[in-house]
Interface confidence: low
């Protein structure tokens, strides 16, 4: 993303990660007699279909891999540029997708990449100069490694490790909403929505036609892209004669608020522009499309409202699981709260707390959600996505519970099964009051900080807050250090 990153997070640092939380359930793979294999527990319960035929495939695969057993299985997703070259990135180069097939599985995961947006000629030119990969396919690598929810390793992806994985690079800069080609009038193409449609069409010829479930997922702008496109994907599949494919959404870090900025600023560049201003301008510049049912709720010129999760969600037909940090860095960036490592002022601190409260309020009626009280941005394709817990439940577990709710009757069950929750929103009030939040490191020293250190670093006034809570400062500090 374009925003300045103040806090460095696990996975971006060479030092040892903190003690990891538990890994996924996996049935174990039995090593061959005396074979020094790099084996790990595998979850065969995730294998759909005929077990015998699956085991036969495994046996034949094992035999063919035996000579190179020291090498790792290829985890990469392979690039396919769209055959329909009229569906393009901003610069007119063909859009595309990365695919890793899983022949035994009828689950398909389509992931929409994020990366902000641009909404006028100036900031799109600037984006083209500095972040060309997000506007052109010309320099895309031939392969990508699947991480987090795109990983085929059960320990990294207990949720859907066995699924067919598709990564759709973001090269349209339009929050996946556009449907306008490059022309004499338009220097750039904005075809995000059409790219998704075209990828789905092409995948039908690569096995998607036999899918049981298509999960459209995305992070950041890709998360908002999920909200904007999930119903349209379901409609497309119905039109093309595949009504039995269940389409669901997973929107990560794309549930933004059209709130008032902490400090009002002019809409000069992408990251300082208030959310509503940026989207109002963008939707015109991109010829952006929003879901039809949402569009009908707002008068002409007000379609920008549909880019905001809490407004579009109630209009969606497809089930959507919302993942959102309560203190999202991108939200704070557009709200002009810049955490530069200097202690924050009291006004900022109250603004941040209030943001968490507001966000929590918007998730009240969202059936499936996971919202930890952390200062962060994006999670589902981070390799530490299994680590964070809300009320003792990890995200992969919550997704598993959500999945199960569809099996227990054909309708999405509104009440989660006992012990298998999927509406998980933190209720503690400060950033990182959840002890499983991604580790924070001091930007300058690289040192890990505990919650108490972090909050004090941000100017958190222990005395005042302890007074407000009616407790001893030392007790409050102890609670914070333990993450309570």
């Amino acid at each position: 993303s374009e925003g300045r990153k103040t806090w460095r997070r696990r996975g971006q640092q060479p030092p040892q990660p903190p003690p990891p939380p538990p890994l996924p359930q996996r049935a174990e793979v039995e090593p061959g007699a005396g074979q020094p294999v790099e084996s790990f527990p595998l979850d065969f319960t995730a294998v759909e279909g005929n077990m015998d035929s699956f085991m036969a495939q495994v046996k034949s695969l094992a035999q063919s891999l035996y000579p190179c057993s020291a090498q790792q299985l290829n985890e990469d997703l392979r690039l396919h540029l769209l055959l329909n070259t009229s569906v393009t990135c901003n610069d007119g180069s063909p859009a595309g997708y990365y695919l890793k097939e899983s022949k035994g599985s009828r689950r398909w995961l389509l992931f929409l990449e994020g990366g902000w947006y641009c909404f006028n000629r100036e900031n799109c030119d600037s984006r083209y100069d500095t972040m060309r990969r997000l506007m052109s396919s010309k320099d895309w690598p031939h392969t990508r490694t699947g991480t987090g929810i795109l990983s085929s390793q059960p320990e990294e992806n207990p949720h859907w490790w066995n699924a067919n994985m598709v990564f759709i690079p973001y090269c349209s800069s339009d929050v996946w909403s556009g449907a306008s080609p490059k022309s004499d009038k338009n220097e750039y193409a904005f075809m995000g929505s059409l790219i998704i449609q075209e990828v789905v069409r092409e995948l039908l010829g690569k096995g998607l036609s036999g899918a049981k479930v298509l999960l459209l997922a995305g992070s950041s702008a890709g998360g908002t892209g999920v909200l904007l496109n999930v119903d349209r994907v379901a409609e497309l599949l119905e039109e093309l004669g595949y009504p039995s494919i269940q389409v669901r959404g997973l929107a990560d870090s794309g549930w933004f608020l059209d709130n008032k900025q902490y400090r009002r600023s002019d809409c000069i560049d992408t990251i300082n522009c208030a959310p509503t201003d940026a989207i109002r301008r963008g939707i015109r510049y991109w010829s952006g499309m929003v879901p039809e049912r949402c569009q009908r709720q707002f008068k002409e010129g007000e379609e920008w409202n549909c880019f905001f999760g809490y407004k579009v969600y109630p209009t969606l037909r497809c089930p959507v699981f919302v993942v959102q940090w309560l203190f999202d860095e991108a939200q704070l960036t557009v709200d002009n709260v810049h955490l530069t490592g200097q202690p924050v002022q009291e006004g900022q601190w109250l603004y941040i707390q209030n943001l968490g409260r507001e966000l929590r309020g918007t998730l009240k009626d969202v059936q499936a959600s996971f919202a930890p009280a952390c200062l962060s941005h994006e999670i589902i394709i981070r390799s530490y996505w299994t680590d964070v817990q809300v009320k003792g439940t990890s995200l992969p577990r919550a997704l598993h519970c959500w999945d199960r709710s569809f099996h227990d009757s054909h309708k999405a069950s509104k009440t989660p099964m006992k012990g298998c929750p999927f509406h998980l929103v933190d209720s503690c009030p400060w950033p990182h009051c959840n002890p499983s939040c991604p580790t924070i490191r001091d930007q300058f020293t690289g040192q890990e900080m505990n919650v108490a250190q972090f909050l004090m670093h941000m100017g958190f006034d222990v005395q005042t807050v302890a007074q407000q809570q009616g407790m001893e400062p030392s007790k409050l500090l102890g609670m914070l250090s333990n993450g309570n």
Partner: antibody, heavy 119, light 111 residues
Amino acid sequence: EVQLVESGGGLVKPGGSLKLSCAASGFTFSDYGMHWFRQAPEKGLEWVAYISSGSRTVYYADTVKGRFTISRDNAKNTLSLQMTSLRSEDTAMYYCARKHYNGGYFDVWGTGTTVTVSS
Amino acid sequence: DIVLTQSPASLAVSLGQRATISCRASKIVSTSGYSYMHWYQQKPGQPPKLLIYLASNLESGVPARFSGSGSGTDFTLNIHPVEEEDAATYYCQHSRELPPTFGSGTKLEIK
């Protein structure tokens, strides 16, 4: 309360058979892989067998392969271990244990049932 | 199979002091930043009880005087300060592959 209770142990002659059961309660049994372990008198813990949550996968220790069969009935929340061709070295306390769905450790154990193989 | 060598076989520690138990694996049991080593306590006539999972995570309900550390092949369980009720046999267990094996146990006696 999360609980596992074994039953079915007893005295049996070498070459005989016995079926152990493990009744689960207090949790969603069908979510978890289950294991059997044993502990000979004054000895350490030994893994015996594993069954995945949906019964699709089973594994056995080399010492019991071909003689013991692990099974489960998710509708009845029951895990079983059918033991045949018993030998004196199978004498032990047998425990069923729940494998936590994260990470390969055993967070719930039964109280155990004693199997004695002797003529 | 991965062999876990536990030491010492037994130890006697005074009340309030520190008990340290080591476990060495015959092969690396850590991967991708995770260490598949766990610790259990067993008292006579009782089943094992999980204390520490994934090398250093305290199982819910276990007193904070128990702690685990280590990675790769070498792992340690510390108990400090030792209390009367900690007299038991302690086992390490790996889950890096099948079969999951246990150390031979360390018997802790309180002086």
